[in-house]
Interface confidence: medium
């Protein structure tokens, strides 16, 4: 609502949506119900899974994914095909800047897409999303000049995270509100799989405990975790197979050394 | 930090106009829903407007609708209330304020607007 | 349109629980915020999603929402929570506020 995409994605690869109202964020309405249903992500040109509160919010809101990729993928219903979302960065490049919540003052850096430049932010210590770097070089090598290399569209290396940031990260509650603790990820692994199976479970803002699983970067396992109905992240599945099947394929052991503790 | 100041308002007579200003800085302004809230003298809060998105779609209380135009200027991080045909009952401080979500998280100090002939 | 209901005063002793109420036929649905104000002050908000509290927020605010009463309440009461407190939802589109509330702190 208060963040919504931009009608176009001129800027977010060479597929156009269907309608304007395929560009929208994901919008889960000022009210409480949980009602699973699905919207099209302009970043990953994919159709997904929110939890939507039952009242206003916006158009982009299916309630299956074959409606969603009917009325938003362009030649869904004749080739049955995935859309491919053409971008070489991780999507949460592309992500508008969130100082969050907290009322702190940090010195960091994102991705401005306008500009396809990394810019300094104030953020405000808690929340927030993954357009967040610590460093203005950590910025530019994971967004700015992504890598380019064989492996498939969107994958980052768990290396690229494993430095002193707060970009992957364990969660902690204070106040209330989900604030980043210490990163506590694996030195010897490489993940290059979907981003989102890097973030911290995350179990929302709202008040229902909905039993989730969320896949554990460190371990390389899906873990159960209390979903509170809404907001959170998409590292978030409703079953242990659903998780393991969308992230542990990206896991790639290396063949030295295990897992630095 | 984030920080919203609010300016223009002064002593109008009815039937006048005014065109308040908030200067927002310390974040990415273009990415948030704006609106002005009112607070008469001793009296409770009272939404006037709201700016929302990248189509800058606008909303107005009725007591409002056709005598206030809400607009914004991303490249000057400011937003405007245009205020015509302006009562007695418009007197109050205006407050700009930034939506979060579903809630105001920041607020400006306000600035006082009172009509009066 | 939706009313919220608050009411127009409280009173409570320094170091006892505060309760203010915000009544409306849909707050059973809607999300509830509490916003504080004191004198000559813009407002702030103390709780948002019925429930969660700012960081920088005392932990003595807390907010509950269920039937179509948001309730904030403030535990050991001390004399700088005096203000007025506004409850805020959302209806068709647009926010509303509660009338407010005056909290005042006796003694």
């Known amino acids: 609502l208060s963040e919504e995409a931009d009608d176009t994605d001129s800027e977010l690869g060479s597929m156009k949506p269907l309608h304007t109202f395929c560009a929208m964020k994901a919008d889960d309405g000022p009210c409480k119900a949980m009602i699973r249903s699905y919207f099209f992500n302009m970043y990953t040109h994919q159709c997904e899974e929110f939890i939507y509160g039952g009242c206003e919010g916006n158009e982009n809101r299916f309630d299956t994914l074959e409606e969603c990729k009917k009325t938003c993928i362009p030649g869904y219903e004749k080739t049955a095909v995935k859309a491919a979302s053409g971008a070489e960065r991780p999507d949460f490049c592309f992500l508008e800047e969130d100082p969050g919540l907290c009322r702190g003052y940090m010195k960091r850096y994102l991705y401005n897409n306008q500009t396809k430049q990394c810019e300094r932010f104030v953020y405000g210590g808690c929340l927030g999303n993954r357009n967040n770097f610590e460093t203005l070089d950590e910025c530019k090598k994971i967004c700015e000049n992504p890598v380019h290399s064989p492996s498939p569209v969107n994958e980052v290396q768990m290396s690229d995270y494993v430095t002193d940031g707060n970009t992957v990260t364990d969660r902690s509650t204070v106040n209330n509100i989900v604030v980043p603790q210490s990163p506590k990820v694996p030195r010897r692994r490489d993940y290059r799989g979907r981003p989102w199976c890097l973030q911290p479970a995350d179990s929302g803002l709202c008040k229902a405990s909905e039993r989730r699983f969320y896949y554990n970067s460190a371990t390389g396992k899906c873990h159960r975790f209390n979903y509170t109905g809404c907001g959170g992240n998409n590292n978030n599945f409703t079953t242990r197979r659903r998780c393991l099947r969308s992230c542990k394929t990206g896991l790639i052991k290396n063949k030295s050394k295990g897992v630095v503790k | 930090q984030v920080q919203l100041v609010e300016s223009g308002g002064g002593l109008v007579q009815p039937g006048g106009s005014l065109r308040l200003s908030c200067a927002a800085s310390?974040?990415?302004?273009?990415?948030?829903?704006m609106d002005w809230v009112r607070q008469a003298p001793g009296k409770g809060l009272e939404w006037v407007s709201s700016i929302r998105g990248s189509r800058s779609s606008t909303y107005y209380a009725d007591s409002v609708k056709g005598r206030f135009t809400i607009s914004r200027d991303n490249s000057k991080n400011t937003l405007y209330l245009q205020m015509n045909s302006l009562r007695a009952e418009d007197t109050a401080v205006y407050y700009c304020?930034?939506?979060?979500?579903?809630?105001?998280?920041?607020w400006g100090q306000g600035t006082l607007v009172t009509v009066s002939s | 349109d939706i009313e919220l209901t608050q009411p127009p005063s409280v009173s409570v002793a320094p170091g006892q629980t505060a309760r203010i109420s915000c009544s409306g036929d849909?707050?059973?649905?809607?999300?509830a915020h509490w916003y504080q104000q004191k004198p000559g002050q813009a407002p702030v908000v103390v709780i948002f999603y019925d429930v969660n509290r700012p960081s920088g927020i005392p932990e003595r605010f807390s907010g509950s929402n269920s039937g179509n009463t948001a309730t904030l309440t403030i535990s050991g009461t001390q004399a700088e929570d005096e203000a007025d407190y506004y409850c805020q939802s959302w209806w068709d589109g647009v926010p509303v506020f509660g009338g407010g509330t005056k909290l005042t702190v006796l003694g």
């Open positions: 849909n707050l059973r649905k809607y999300y």
């Open positions: 310390g974040f990415t302004f273009r990415s948030y829903g």
């Open positions: 304020a930034r939506l979060y979500r579903y809630w105001f998280d920041y």
